[in-house]
Amino acid sequence: LIIGFGISGRHSITVTTVASAGNIGEDGILSCTFEPDIKLSDIVIQWLKEGVIGLVHEFKEGKDELSEQDEMFRGRTAVFADQVIVGNASLRLKNVQLTDAGTYKCYIITSKGKGNANLEYKTGAFSMPEVNVDYNASSETLRCEAPRWFPQPTVVWASQVDQGANFSEVSNTSFELNSENVTMKVVSVLYNVTINNTYSCMIENDIAKATGDIKVTESEIKRRSHLQLLNSKAS
């Protein structure tokens, strides 16, 4: 969480941002909130990016003002106009690109004053893993697949029964480049599994951590998946 305060001159207002991550090819949110103000016509929201000459986005006098917008963001940004009244200046970024990563500044002007806060935005690819029993294998085998990751993650297997056990000797992980030549499909196979046990396939890079669990018993198979972004720090 980054909390920024205003600049000298007018009274300062508090602006708060939250570091976040964008999944390339999908839409992302850059979070920013400020002290709401009743005089809506005076509210100006500017999003800037370090190293970029033009603006990422500008909202003033109740509408988008995009004449100064940088080419790389053309047609890809929007604020939530109905949320500005409650102090939400978050930016929607469409079709996140790898090059969107960097330091952004959320700069706010209201009738009460000015304020800004920076936000670190990471970009990559992350997806939920699915763990299945591989019935084609010669021994009891589990197959963990996740369609899109970048940068290349690590994959670790764990088991509820054999806690702390190292499964690297009985597992095999491969990374297959997807058609857009950036993200990769992750496939990890775990051999010699036993029934009545819960196995977890944990995939992690510097942006996200995802876990796929599978519990195999004689009568049923239960699955669960979970994904967590690692860098959600507020400013």
């Epitope: 009743i38 809506l40 005076d42 109740g62 109905d82 009244i85």
Partner: antibody, heavy 116, light 107 residues
Amino acid sequence: QVQVVQSGAEVKKPGSSVKVSCKASGDTFSNYAISWVRQAPGQGLEWMGGIIPIFGITNYAQKFQGRVTIIADKSTRTAYMELSSLRSEDTAVYYCSRGGPYFDYWGQGILVTVSS
Amino acid sequence: EIVMTQSPATLSVSPGERATLSCRASQSVSSNLAWYQQKPGQAPRLLIYGASTRATGIPARFSGSGSGTEFTLTISSLQSEDFAVYYCQQYKKWPFTFGPGTKVDIK
């Protein structure tokens, strides 16, 4: 000096509609939101919805969705709130106020009585 | 929606005494909270916004504090004109919601 002036009291039959108005002085329409808040006899305050003329946005409380319409006429600096399918529980004083997110100037209120 | 609760429902205070009114939100509203005063037959009047900022023309005896889910309105020394109903209102999220009110009457 900011002034918010509302129309007069109304008596309506159940099932009918009521349209009440609110005229604001000064720069209210070009700079602020206009909200409608009602108060049933002996009860508390209830936000019904609001309009932000400069943003071109209206927002209604879920409870009134589909029954309430708020519009603003910038040329006459007048906001209107229409409530349809009236029932006896809609008997209340209806206030127009400058604002959202909070409300700094209020009209005098309009008593709308719904009775057969 | 965010539900606002106020306590007590009625507060009986003697003139010159201090009055402390509480308001609680069902989830965090940060400092996005306002307080209003309403006298019988009149429209509400804005006292405090931003949890602690006095509105224009509001006497210094009115003060607001708190953030997140717990808020307090304090009237340091009650004057005869302060006997009224007080409402809190959150504006963190649409729809804006009011508390049920606290009536401050003469002891």
